[in-house]
């Protein structure tokens, strides 16, 4: 009965500081509500990135001011955090519950490792 | 610092209402789904009720649904419990607690005693 | 429903032991979803483990959580005159949320 997520190990950002991934999630029911959450763990300390609640069927929809967006097809969520430096390197996790009908479910994937190397500035040109 | 203070417990009648507040500082309260869990003098943990985030989505344990109201309003950072029908059976210290974003309860509240006698 | 049976329902034992607590649930529960905690008397429940495994913020190393599918294990390496108290289990990966009946654990 437990709900399964499953997302990549690794993902490498882009120069733009631009990384994208899927989250998959195996549902033990049949949800019409669902919410997804992206947590950033960092020696033990977990904290939100951003999280969307959206109807089967219909777009995921981050707040306007997010650094996330995504697309969900089925079962299947695509998630692609911006605005990305090398700080922000770290784990993220994907969280997915679902919120409607009864009962309600948590599924928490391992964490998609995320590198970010921040874009050598460009030398001045004579 | 993050914490949780219940208030509005009480000695009431069988039938009669209550009504629990749970005051949170120290978080983002909107981002975080909410608990109600009693305790009955002398015995073990009952999860009673929850309210996630926006507060649309509640779910509430067969013992009391029907009967409790969970709501919460974010603008004030707090939670309530709205008990009705009260019977000696929802005697018990009741807890609210937050549930951590991997899900576990990692912050509690000291509790408000609730009796239910005649 | 999971229902939760923690074993034994008093474990008595002297300072400096060790400490293992049983719990079994009902179907399987993913290790995820799976959390003790630590009461003492007149106080709010402590969370000590989540994730079956992993440590809460402040909980000193000699608690221990390990165990999948229905059986898991909380373990106290070296007892200190502070922990003995009232051990519950949950799981947290489906409504309802449920608790164990708890273990206490008391001074020989």
């Known amino acids: 009965k437990a709900m399964h997520v499953a997302q990549p190990a690794v993902v490498l950002a882009s120069s733009r500081g631009i990384a994208s991934f899927v989250c998959e999630y195996a549902s033990p029911g049949k949800a019409t509500e669902v919410r997804v959450t992206v947590l950033r763990q960092a020696d033990s300390q977990v904290t939100e990135v951003c999280a969307a609640t959206y109807m089967m069927g219909n777009e995921l929809t981050f707040l306007d001011d997010s650094i996330c967006t995504g697309t969900s097809s089925g079962n299947q969520v695509n998630l692609t955090i911006q605005g990305l430096r090398a700080m922000d390197t770290g784990l993220y996790i994907c969280k997915v519950e679902l919120m409607y009908p009864p009962p309600y479910y948590l599924g928490i994937g391992n964490g998609t490792q995320i590198y970010v190397i921040d874009p050598e500035p460009c030398p001045d040109s004579d | 610092q993050v914490q949780l203070v219940e208030s509005g417990g009480g000695v009431v009648q069988p039938g009669r209402s209550l009504r629990l507040s749970c005051a949170a500082s120290g978080f983002t309260f909107s981002s975080y789904g909410v608990h109600w869990v009693r305790q009955a003098p002398g015995k073990g943990l009952e999860w009673v009720s929850v309210?996630?985030?926006?507060?649309?989505?509640?779910f509430y344990a067969d013992s009391v649904k029907g009967r409790f109201t969970i709501s919460r309003d974010n603008s004030k950072n707090t939670l309530y419990l709205q008990m009705n029908s009260l019977r000696a059976e929802d005697t018990a210290v009741y807890f609210c607690?937050?549930?951590?974003?991997?899900?576990?309860?990692?912050?509690w509240g000291r509790g408000t005693m609730v009796t239910v006698s005649s | 429903e999971i229902v939760l049976t923690q074993s034994p329902g008093t474990l008595s034992l002297s300072p400096g032991e060790r400490a293992t607590l049983s719990c079994r649930a009902s179907?399987?529960?993913?290790?995820?979803?799976l959390a003790w905690y630590q009461q003492k008397p007149g106080q709010a429940p402590r969370l000590l483990i989540y994730?079956?495994?992993s440590r809460a913020t402040g909980i000193p190393d000699r608690f221990s959580g390990s165990g999948s599918g229905t059986d898991f294990t909380l373990t106290i390496s070296r007892l200190e005159p502070e922990d003995f108290a009232v051990y519950y289990c949950q799981q947290y990966g489906s409504s309802p949320w449920t608790f164990g009946q708890g273990t206490k654990v008391e001074i020989k």
């Open positions: 994730g079956a495994s």
């Open positions: 309210i996630l985030y926006d507060g649309n989505n509640k």
């Open positions: 179907q399987s529960v993913s290790s995820s979803y």
């Open positions: 607690a937050r549930g951590a974003l991997l899900g576990a309860f990692d912050i």
